[in-house]
């Protein structure tokens, strides 16, 4: 019997981390700056990096630009988009910006996009200034199943921050659905 | 039999519980404002509260202003600074600010630093108005191992809200790294 | 004994799954924009949506404007609060705005209310620019005791953007207290 | 990188009058806070008027009254007035801009700066 509890507990350990291991997914996507779209209306951003810096993904996809889930449950998801304009770059356009991401979700069974996340701000970004920045951060709960994808979408994309640090959106599984 | 499956049940909730308390290190370390340095420019904020107020840690290490992992594994990482002008403390030199946070990881087997996150904004605080306020929020999912340190670097220090409520940082560990 | 481990793994699946699930009560709410107060001053939000769109709630309990703790733990908390106005909603008082949200904690035993957490900024929108758009995300890792109420107050809550994806709050537990 | 030219320095007899200007090379020179400082050979540089971005101003108790410093930022331009000048203010009067620290009062001293001109030259005559 003893042999047996040392069986069923070493059995256990092993199954215990396993079992957690696989039931937390996550990812942490930074952007991949040498695809950006150009343009100042709302567009989905594409390309971002999933296996370098600090950019990783464990039991979800990176697939055409979006991140899909592969299991069922409740995910923390979030977002930190860096925007920037220097005078070297030339003049803004309009120095009165709408600087915005919004963090969507698609199901491919039921062909529909739903925003589950929105941030921003108008800005005045005026010439009296060499250099302009803001940022935005977005976080939230949310009930996603397998199959279904998150991305991106942002306003102004070619003044997007293009460091690692600046522009980014991940995920992680915090529990099962019951 | 009986009694040794409640001895082998007694004993898996006892170690369940136990190692889940154990892989989970956090901390909330809020603004110690006593000790805050001068300068507009990029500056490391190392005075901060650990047992205080909402300030709290567990199985991580606090030490000479930063906050030390003891414990390999992916944690989500926040921070949220808040800056602040009243006319009472004094005129402006700029109107034109830039109130930015870097969230750093230093490593000290390969003394190196890198940021993993930042956040900010470029501001017009006209002297029209007696009151600004501006508050930048970060977080991410970021593997950490032991021994790596994480801090804090801000611009404008002097212009930051001393409030627990306002300018903090913290951790907490999701999941054991594969 | 092959049939008893057998049980006892089968019992222990059970046990760790019910118990993991019992462990972690969220709530992700969004904001009922049918009853939104006036004003520009400081003001509670007491409408919020638990169940329908992306709001949820599970072993925690919406009531009275409040989000009620069930189950003492660590939490991490979270708000996203919009704010907008469109030249078409008729002129604004004053250009000049204090956009502010507070994350606040309400014993009962002891009655008492504090800020866990603040953030925001001061704004001037100008009648130059037919729209404004402000985001303020805040988030923080803290400890809940059964019975303790989290609610948001805001400044400003007439110009709220209405939106689930745009004005929400959320918590989910992250662990046991030791 | 902002370069600062003065200029209007020269030889005044004491009660005269000067007016110093001094040029920026950006057109941002609207976002950074301007200051004037004075030197005689064999002292420290000396602080004489600060002008914030808005064109709030602080003076070394020496000139109060009789100084006025002055900024356009339409033509990048930074001015000081000096009336009633004294002997005592011959000095190579230098322009700086800086903005590396947020409150007016810091920029009484020198470190706050990031720019500074090559200086022009006053001499005040008895």
């Known amino acids: 019997i003893r042999a047996e509890k040392a069986m069923v507990d070493g059995s256990w350990l092993d199954l215990a981390k396993r079992s957690k291991l696989e039931a937390q997914p996550f990812a942490h996507l930074t952007i991949n700056a040498t695809d950006i779209p150009s343009g100042s209306h709302k567009v989905s951003l594409s390309s971002w990096y999933h296996d370098r810096g600090w950019a990783k993904i464990s039991n979800m996809t990176f697939s055409n630009g979006k991140l899909i889930v592969n299991q069922d449950g409740f995910y923390y998801l979030y977002a930190n988009i860096c925007f920037r304009h220097h005078e070297t770059s030339g003049d803004l356009a309009t120095e009165y910006l709408q600087l915005m991401v919004y963090v969507t979700k698609t199901s491919i069974k039921i062909p529909s996009s739903h925003t589950l996340m929105k941030g921003g701000s108008t800005k005045y970004w005026s010439g009296n200034s060499e250099f302009h920045f803001y940022s935005i951060n977005v976080g939230g709960f949310f009930k996603l199943r397998s199959g279904e994808e998150i991305s991106i979408e942002v306003s102004n994309p070619s003044l997007l921050d293009p460091d690692q640090d600046a522009t980014y959106f991940g995920a992680f599984k915090v529990r099962d659905i019951d | 039999i009986r009694a040794e499956k409640a001895m082998v049940d007694g004993s898996w909730l006892d170690l369940a519980k136990r190692s889940k308390l154990e892989a989970q290190p956090f901390a909330h370390l809020t603004i110690n404002a006593t000790d805050i340095p001068s300068g507009s420019h990029k500056v490391s904020l190392s005075s901060w509260y650990h047992d205080r107020g909402w300030a709290k840690i567990s199985n991580m290490t606090f030490s000479n202003g930063k906050l030390i992992v003891n414990q390999d594994g992916f944690y989500y990482l926040y921070a949220n600074i808040c800056f602040r002008h009243h006319e009472t403390s004094g005129d402006l030199a700029t109107e034109y600010l830039q109130l930015m946070v870097y969230v750093t990881k230093t490593s000290i087997k390969i003394p190196s630093s890198h940021t993993l996150m930042k956040g900010g904004s470029t501001k017009y605080w006209s002297g029209n108005s007696e009151f600004h306020f501006y508050s930048i929020n970060v977080g991410g999912f970021f593997k950490l191992r032991s021994g790596e340190e994480i801090s804090i670097e801000v611009s404008n220090p002097s212009l930051l809200d001393p409030d627990q409520d306002a300018t903090y940082f913290g951790a907490f560990k999701v999941r054991d790294i594969d | 004994i092959r049939a008893e481990k057998a049980m006892v793994d089968g019992s222990w699946l059970d046990l760790a799954k019910r118990s993991k699930l019992e462990a972690q009560p969220f709530a992700h709410l969004t904001i009922n924009a049918t009853d939104i107060p006036s004003g520009s001053h400081k003001v509670s939000l007491s409408s919020w949506y638990h169940d329908r769109g992306w709001a949820k709630i599970s072993n925690m309990t919406f009531s009275n404007g409040k989000l009620i703790v069930n189950q003492d733990g660590f939490y991490y908390l979270y708000a996203n609060i919009c704010f907008r106005h469109h030249e078409t909603s008729g002129d604004l008082a004053t250009e000049y705005l204090q956009l502010m949200v507070y994350v606040t904690k309400t014993s009962i035993k002891i009655p008492s209310s504090h800020t866990l957490m603040k953030g925001g900024s001061t704004k001037y929108w100008s009648g130059n620019s037919e729209f404004h758009f402000y985001s303020i995300n805040v988030g923080g890792f803290f400890k809940l005791r059964s019975g303790e109420e989290i609610s948001i107050e805001v400044s400003n809550p007439s110009l709220l953007d209405p939106d689930q994806d745009a004005t929400y709050f959320g918590a989910f537990k992250v662990r046991d207290i030791d | 990188e902002v370069q600062l030219v003065e200029s209007g320095g020269g030889l005044v007899q004491a009660g005269g009058s000067l007016r110093l200007s001094c040029v920026a090379s950006?057109?941002?020179?609207?976002?950074?806070?301007m200051g004037w400082f004075r030197q005689v050979p064999g002292k420290e540089r000396d602080f004489v008027a600060a002008?914030?971005?808005?064109?709030?101003?602080i003076y070394a108790d020496s000139v109060k009254g009789r100084f006025a410093i002055s900024r356009d930022n339409a033509k990048n331009t930074v001015y000081l007035q000096m009336n009633s000048l004294k002997p005592e203010d011959t000095a190579v009067y230098y322009c700086?801009?800086?903005?590396?620290?947020?409150?007016?009062?810091?920029?009484?001293?020198?470190?706050?700066?990031?720019?500074w001109g090559q200086g022009t030259q006053v001499t005040v005559s008895s």
């Open positions: 002008i914030t971005t808005g064109s709030i101003t």
């Open positions: 700086a801009a800086g903005n590396r620290e947020p409150y007016l009062r810091q920029y009484t001293a020198s470190n706050p700066y990031d720019y």
């Open positions: 950006k057109r941002t020179f609207a976002s950074y806070a």
